[in-house]
Interface confidence: low
């Protein structure tokens, strides 16, 4: 007769690696008498012998997962006792090797020229894919506005025209490499002003011909105002050669005045415009010129350069030492404070902030910053920040407030211009304008209904409709 | 005319550390990236480091991760490489060199002369 | 880990034509690698002679050329000169998880 003998373990568990779906076995064979019984864990957790998702053959020593998923990753133990001497245990882990699949793939996008766009692509796998892009036939590289995100989005900074075209994301792992489906990215072009009319100041009944030049997708128009109306008498000439046109207005001056050149493309159902402005005076004509507070000049910095209008104007203080560090360094800290506010408000009180403290500018005569517009300040305030806002009221109030909002160089909404008194006498936020398309997308932010609508001027810069592909923060 | 003078380089022991400096002139410091580059003696170049003209990302060959850090002082128009924990096999001719652009990973189009780091005990 | 290869020397006889070439120890080279080529003569720092594959640095002579042959990036000098003797490195931006930029060991080229 045998003489009795405690298990041994002669094969002890190793690392398996299996791919999802696919078998993946454990041996732990046991040599002993009388016969054992094995018994398996998974990370210490008892697996039953009816567990279908297994079979567990040869007295115990063989565990085989049958289908295997991404959640049986884990440690698994086999402990065999035969009430001669103690249990002994043998343990390996199971490793789940998965080829890359892309979860969230790209979709086509329809973004403004400017702005921010990301396109999604989600992937999982094991080990984890790394992603790249490729735009049209070549692998896109990575620079200074475009950059592949930890998540594998593609996120492209201050696009540009020359970023339109077909891109795909690949994900590659050891395992292989799985392609999106090519999308579609389209970039639409605000009219924007290349030369703008120049001030003259003539003798009474000279001639003077103001030219402007504007750019676009599709070609804008362009019209003149005098002193706000639409020009009444003077010969315009017109022409139009590739995305450009150039107009130019000839004046018999008897009177001075202020002519506006307005260029505006329509983009689906929306409008963009782009306005510069010059002024005729007459020379006989005696005016007391007030000094200037500062100067016209386009923006350097980095931290608005995506929300301002690009190539546009901006105003500087000259009431600082060194106005361009002096406005660029309030901003950076305003954008610190940002940090603190809601998702919804962030982008709306970015647009605000930069184009308050850096107001669009008419060089002319006189530089002179053009405010944000009353209802544009109003939205910000009631509708996407009307939480931040409140609070920060009243905490203000009672010196409770040290975040979110409360250092932020916000402007009196009350104090500020409206447009529907004068609309070329402040700027609109275009952020506002094609985020009051998807605004039915977010959450509730006050009790009542707020006490503005987001302005929808066909005058306004152009509005669209915000697709998730891209996002302002 | 673009200038890059690289300094800090020296003889120091295993496990020492090391600052170097490298100041720029002759162009708009603040516009470019910037990288550093070395060559051990006898041997060819490798690349150590990258920053873009925002110093908002850092990029280190696998080497020398966690031991070296890339910073730019836009303000003194000067690019630094921390030298930490060094090892023999770091002694070399370090070289600042300018990027063509903006981006981390430009072309190299402009070097400076190179100091030398002896890490030796 | 992924090599960047060049022949280790190369000899030109003056006037002559010579490729020198740039590969990958595991793939090809494209011009999604940026190829960029430097020469470097002993005790000088690097000069830039061509960067993303075939664009020219200012002031490099029109003898140097880059391209892509094969999968390999390749340097072409025409006409050697005595003075284009020197070490010539090939560098590739490499991503694969993470961003860098890799040179060649060099090739060192004679011009006899």
């Known amino acids: 007769e045998k003489l009795p003998k405690a298990p041994v373990i002669t094969t002890p568990l190793e690392t398996v690696d299996a791919l999802v779906e696919e078998v993946a076995t454990f041996m732990c064979a046991v040599e002993s008498y009388p016969q054992p019984e094995i018994s398996w864990t998974r990370n210490k957790i008892l697996i039953k012998l009816f567990d279908t998702r297994y079979s567990i053959r040869e007295n115990g020593q063989l565990l085989t997962i049958l289908s295997v998923e991404d959640s049986d990753d884990g440690i698994y133990c086999c402990t065999a006792n035969n009430g001669v001497g103690g249990a002994v245990e043998s343990c390996g882990a199971l490793q789940v090797k998965m080829k890359p699949k892309i979860t969230r793939p790209p979709i086509n996008v329809k973004i403004i020229e400017g702005l921010k766009a990301v396109l999604p692509c989600t992937t999982m796998g094991n080990p984890k894919p790394s992603v790249s892009w490729i735009k049209g036939d070549s692998a896109l590289r990575e620079n200074s506005r475009i950059a592949v995100l930890e998540s594998g989005s593609l996120r492209i900074h201050n696009v540009q025209k020359e970023d339109a075209g077909q891109y795909r994301c690949v994900a590659k792992n050891s395992l292989g490499t799985a392609y999106s489906k090519l999308v579609k990215l389209e970039v639409e072009v605000f009219a924007r002003i290349l030369r703008a009319p120049e001030s003259h100041n003539v003798t009474f009944g000279s001639f003077v011909t103001l030219r402007c030049t504007a750019i676009g997708m599709p070609v804008p128009t362009i019209s003149w105002i005098e002193n706000g109306n639409a020009v009444s008498s003077g010969s315009i000439q017109e022409n139009v050669k590739d995305r450009v046109i150039d107009s130019r207005l000839q004046l018999f001056i008897t009177k001075p005045g202020l002519y506006t050149c307005i260029a505006t493309n329509k983009h689906g159902e929306k409008f963009s415009t782009a306005k510069a402005a010059a002024t005729v005076s007459i020379a006989e004509w005696s005016k007391s010129q007030k000094e200037s507070k500062g100067y016209c000049a386009q923006y350097r910095g980095e931290v608005c350069d995506a929300v301002l209008v690009k190539d546009s104007l901006v105003f500087f203080n000259t009431s600082y030492p060194d106005p361009e560090e002096a406005q660029e360094l309030l901003i950076h800290t305003a954008w610190n404070e940002l940090k603190a506010v809601s998702p919804l408000c962030r982008p709306a009180a970015e647009a605000l902030l930069c184009n308050h403290l850096f107001q669009e500018c008419s060089p002319g005569v006189l530089p002179t910053p053009m405010p944000i517009c009353r209802e544009y300040c109003l939205a910000v305030k009631e509708l996407f920040c009307a939480k931040e806002w409140l609070a920060m009221e009243g905490k203000t109030h009672r010196g409770l407030y040290r975040s979110g909002m409360h250092f932020l160089p916000v402007p009196e909404c009350s104090k500020l211009p409206s447009m529907h008194q004068d609309p070329t006498a402040c700027t609109r936020l275009p952020y506002l304008d094609y985020k009051k398309e998807n605004i039915t997308t977010f959450p509730s932010i006050t009790s009542s209904k707020p006490s503005v609508d987001i302005p929808n001027l066909p005058a306004s810069t152009s509005s669209f409709a915000v697709s998730p592909a891209y996002s302002m923060t | 005319e673009v200038q890059l003078l690289e300094s800090g380089g020296g003889l120091v022991q295993p496990g020492g550390s090391l600052r170097l400096s490298c100041a720029a002139s002759g162009f708009t410091f603040s516009d470019y990236g910037m990288s550093w580059v070395r060559q051990a003696p006898g041997k060819g170049l490798e690349w150590v480091s990258a920053i873009p003209w925002s110093g908002g990302s850092t990029y280190y060959k696998e080497s020398v991760k966690g031991r070296f850090t890339i910073s730019r002082d836009n303000s003194k128009n000067t690019l630094y490489l921390q030298m930490n924990s060094l090892r023999a096999e770091d002694t070399a001719v370090y070289y600042c060199?300018?990027?063509?652009?903006?981006?981390?990973?430009?072309?190299?189009?402009?070097w400076g002369q190179g100091t030398l780091v002896t890490v030796s005990s | 880990q992924t090599v960047v290869t060049q022949e280790p020397s190369f000899s030109v006889s003056p006037g002559g034509t010579v490729t020198l070439t740039c590969g990958l120890s595991s793939g090809s080279v494209t011009s999604s690698n940026y190829p960029d080529w430097y020469q470097q003569t002993p005790g000088q720092a690097p000069r830039t002679l061509i960067y993303s594959t075939d664009s020219r640095h200012s002031g490099v002579p029109d003898r140097f050329s880059g391209s892509i042959l094969g999968n390999k990036a390749a340097l072409t000098i025409t006409g050697a000169q005595a003075d284009d003797e020197s070490d010539y490195y090939c560098g590739l931006y490499m991503y694969s998880g993470s961003k860098n930029y890799v040179f060649g060991g060099g090739t060192k080229l004679t011009v006899l």
């Open positions: 060199a300018k990027r063509s652009g903006r981006i981390a990973f430009g072309a190299l189009d402009a």
